[in-house]
Interface confidence: low
Amino acid sequence: SDKLYQRKEPVISSVHTKVKGIAEVTENVTEGGVTKLGHSIFDTADYTFPLQGNSFFVMTNYVKSEGQVQTLCPEYPRRGAQCSSDRRCKKGWMDPQSKGIQTGRCVPYDKTRKTCEVSAWCPTEEEKEAPRPALLRSAENFTVLIKNNIHFPGHNYTTRNILPTMNGSCTFHKTWDPQCSIFRLGDIFQEAGENFTEVAVQGGIMGIEIYWDCNLDSWSHHCRPRYSFRRLDDKNTDESFVPGYNFRYAKYYKENNVEKRTLIKAFGIRFDILVFGTGGKF
């Protein structure tokens, strides 16, 4: 309740997160013309990426373009990219939608289609749908530890969400353990009324709100966080211009003294931790 006699001050906060969990990924791997099931293990270093600010990212799905080298090749025949003669291809032109610089030649992409040749990382990335179900759908069972230190400088008061008495094996529950700062990712989605399995395919942005409503008067002192969760991105993926949340990164390597890379389009959940609140004191 609002205490008008108190001097209020907004919270100053710092956040640190640690994600834990292992995922086993099974996907089709084509080698030597033979497609077989490949099994790989993903640990924290494979699926999380350091982000700036109060955010962390968990990869839930991906599309790989393996063995790319810098050379000349036909660009991917996306809509409007096909050509029938060199006239359609402009030397030195960099189409923002393309993956390279045009050489001015119209060349066969495959037996039926021709596209402009580009100087690029080849073969150019194909426009593939994100795998369904998501490859790292088991990320639902990952946990994140959120460390949140707060400070009210005007009141010379500092505290944090993790208390010395807290059990390191607890899991947050709105009713049974509302002060535990270890959250199961699937539970976060459930609390926000979202389906993790569905969002994991294209990715999304989830907000973790930490609200501090602190009464710093010694006779009725109370300063503990309240956690709530809501989805922040446009969930109507069919209607939104660029659905979900994804980015690309590359792993570089040398093979027979030729620099190559594997391009990975990573889909996943960006968790934004939003800390707000006030501290009041007479």
Epitope: T30, E31, G32, G33, S65, E66, G67, Q68, V69, T71, L72, C73, P74, V107, P108, Y109, D110, K111, E117, C122, P123, E255, N256, N257, V258, K260
Partner: nanobody, 130 residues
Framework: EVQLVESGGGLVQPGGSLRLSCSAS??????????MGWFRQAPGKELEFVAA????????YYADSVKGRFTISRHNPRNTVYLQMNSLRPEDTAVYYC?????????????????????WGQGTQVTVSS
């Protein structure tokens, strides 16, 4: 100097199988970043594309006439490409040539064009007859 050496040809009855091998050697040749292909030439006919396997991602390509019957594969550590030929027909009779396209020619996928390939083997004879 790059050398491609084919083996595995011979005489086989219709419906039978053969496995052709092609090994690549040579200091300047980067096998694992090359497109490898098989072509064939029947007496009095033009050189015909049979199958190819991409340098970068093991993608395979086949002529319509051999789809479902022939399988191309490669073994990088041994610098060898294979052509497994099943359900052979008399019209498959030809000299089979192994060809390689090194990355220095660019990554363009003209896999069914002989002009793409800059290295060729001497050929191995395949005869399908009863």
């Amino acid at each position: 100097e790059v050398q491609l050496v084919e083996s595995g040809g011979g005489l086989v009855q219709p419906g039978g199988s053969l496995r052709l091998s092609c090994s690549a050697s040579g200091r300047t040749f980067s096998f694992s970043t090359s497109t490898m292909g098989w072509f064939r030439q029947a007496p009095g006919k033009e050189l015909e594309f049979v199958a190819a396997i991409d340098w970068s991602d093991f993608n395979t390509y086949y002529a319509d006439s051999v789809k479902g019957r022939f399988t191309i594969s490669r073994h990088n550590p041994r610098n060898t490409v294979y052509l497994q030929m099943n359900s052979l027909r008399p019209e498959d009779t030809a000299v089979y040539y192994c060809a390689a396209h090194s990355e220095t020619r660019g990554g363009t996928r003209y896999f069914d064009r002989p002009s793409l390939y800059n290295y060729w083997g001497q050929g191995t004879q395949v005869t399908v007859s009863s």
